[in-house]
């Protein structure tokens, strides 16, 4: 009887193993079919709008990646609380599943815009390197549906690149003026968002828990208007140690204020970066790798 029970256990374990293997094969087949399908949909290097039809909606790019779509490009997503779907660039490299919330690449877009534009989003949602801001409303819906890591990829005009990463990136809602909240920093560019690089400047340079400001909606801690002076919308304090929506200059610049694309802990206030990508992915993201 004991032998029979042991044999039953062994067979059950074998069945479980076989089930797991079958499941893995199913995922692999699905993935190959989808990759094949996406290759037909891809429109080359420049225009990268990928239409998956109305098969199902995805809440972010990590879901798209884990459903087998491994090609970077613009996809439609609909976060849980969001009333409507919207286009976003999914970066399927760097581990995959990144939802790109902002990009600067060539100065082709005007980032000196008002509250409504920053709220709803603006820019080029067609081309691979197109500049855009996803929209504060969309950032709120995205970052409250899950715990996200924000990764900021920075590059200068001397072909150097650095990154900064923050756990638990959250953006508040319209009523609290899209307040920024960030967690633990890691990376190579230095912690310009939380202003932890010097305790004496943190009170005026940190962006943690700052409300969003634009030239027409001033929520900063400065007597003047940071957004107006720095010609961009951002989570200004008095005013900034990072401003990734600043004016596009070619590297070192001189201006009335430090209004370039600034990441203080890497290149200081008077160097405007060549490119920036702000992208998010769930903290606990595990790629479906077979």
């Amino acid at each position: 009887l004991e032998d029979c029970a042991q044999e039953q256990m062994r067979l059950r374990a074998q069945v479980r193993l076989l089930e797991t293997r079958v499941k893995q094969q199913q995922v692999k087949i699905k993935q190959l079919l989808q990759e094949n399908e996406v290759q037909f949909l891809d429109k080359g290097d420049e225009n990268t709008v990928i239409d998956l039809g109305s098969k199902r909606q995805y809440a972010d790019c990590s879901e798209i990646f884990n459903d087998g779509y491994k090609l970077s490009g613009f996809y439609k997503i609909k976060p849980l609380q969001s009333p409507a779907e919207f286009s976003v660039y999914c970066d399927m490299s760097d581990g995959g599943g990144w939802t790109v919330i902002q990009r600067r690449s060539d100065g082709s877009e005007n980032f000196n815009r008002g509250w409504k534009d920053y709220e709803n989003g603006f820019g080029n949602f067609v081309q691979k390197h197109g500049e855009y801001w996803l929209g504060n409303k969309n950032l709120h819906f995205l970052t409250t549906q899950e715990d996200y890591t924000l990764k900021i990829d920075l590059a200068d005009f001397e072909k150097n690149s650095r990154y900064a990463q923050y756990k638990n990136f959250k953006v508040g809602d319209e009523k609290n003026f899209y307040e920024l909240n960030i967690g633990e920093y890691s990376g190579t560019a230095g912690d310009s968002l939380a202003g932890n690089f010097h305790p004496e400047v943190q009170w005026w340079a940190s962006h943690q828990r700052m409300k969003f400001s634009t030239w027409d909606r001033d929520h900063d801690n400065y007597e003047g208007n940071c957004a107006e002076e720095d010609q961009s919308g951002w989570w200004f304090n008095r005013c900034h140690s990072a401003n990734l929506n600043g004016v596009y200059y070619s590297g070192p610049y001189t201006a009335k204020t430090d209004n370039g694309i600034v990441w203080y802990t890497w290149h200081g206030w008077w160097y405007s970066l060549k490119s920036v990508v702000m992208k998010i992915r769930p903290n606990d993201f595990i790629p479906n790798v077979i």
């Epitope: 109305s54 199902r56 909606q57 809440a59 972010d60 879901e63 609909k78 849980l80 609380q81 009333p83 409250t144 549906q145 899950e146 715990d147 638990n168 959250k170 508040g172 809602d173 319209e174 009523k175 609290n176 307040e179 909240n181 769930p282 606990d284």
Partner: antibody, heavy 116, light 106 residues
């Protein structure tokens, strides 16, 4: 770890009001929506509404407008739901919940019994 | 409001059997969530975004579907699976639940 601790059972008279609480711990209270739901005895679940503690912004199921009022006290990380003009139809277990894309945390439920 | 209809209302199965319960939506939804509830307890998240198992859910459970038709399948039912399973949609406000499928083990 994330916990939502709800207040104890309530026995109330028809026509009266009741305020039940949901105390959050183990996370930053202001960063996540709190949803409220009800489950009548032996029945399914109904979504009442949500509140975003970061701004106290609310969104109600049309069915519960005028019946439920959602509030928060951020100093104590507590969400409240007030139910008014109670009838026997409101006898149910009421849940608070924090829903995310890949997980959900629920309170243990508060039984509200409406009886003369 | 989107109405979710679950069938069957009661499902009786023997250990080791394969069972499937369905959830039909009155109009198309983006994703389906499933909860397991045992008497006297809060609902537990079971399947999220149609087909992803929540943490700690055994691999014998799976979810599938799209549009208006979704299902939860248990490849080999075990005694601990006895519970009521609810589907829920997040696609449009108000968020709604199905009436539940009660799984009984013979």
């Amino acid at each position: 770890q994330v916990q939502l601790q709800q207040s104890g059972p309530e026995l109330v008279k028809p026509g009266a009001s009741v305020k039940i609480s949901c105390k959050a711990s183990g996370y930053t209270f202001t960063d996540y929506y709190i949803n409220w739901l009800r489950q009548k005895p032996g029945q399914g679940l109904e979504w009442i509404g949500w509140i975003y503690p970061g701004s106290a912004n609310t969104n109600y199921n049309e069915k519960f407008k005028g019946k439920a009022i959602l509030t928060v006290d951020t100093s104590s990380s507590t969400a409240y739901m007030q139910l008014s003009s109670l009838t026997s139809e409101d006898t149910a277990v009421y849940f608070c919940a924090r829903w995310l894309l890949r997980s959900a945390y629920w309170g243990q439920g508060t039984l509200v019994t409406v009886s003369a | 409001d989107i109405v979710l209809s679950q069938s069957p209302a009661i499902l009786s199965a023997s250990p080791g059997e394969k069972v499937t319960m369905t959830c039909r939506a009155s109009s198309s939804v983006s994703y389906m969530y499933w909860y397991q509830q045992k008497p006297g307890s809060s609902p537990k998240p079971w399947i999220y975004a149609t087909s992803n198992l929540a943490s700690g859910v055994p691999a014998r459970f799976s979810g599938s579907g799209s549009g208006t038709s979704y299902s939860l399948t248990i490849s080999r039912v075990e005694a601990e699976d006895a519970a009521t399973y609810y589907c829920q949609q997040w696609s449009s406000n108000p968020y709604t639940f199905g009436g539940g499928t009660k799984l009984e083990i013979k």
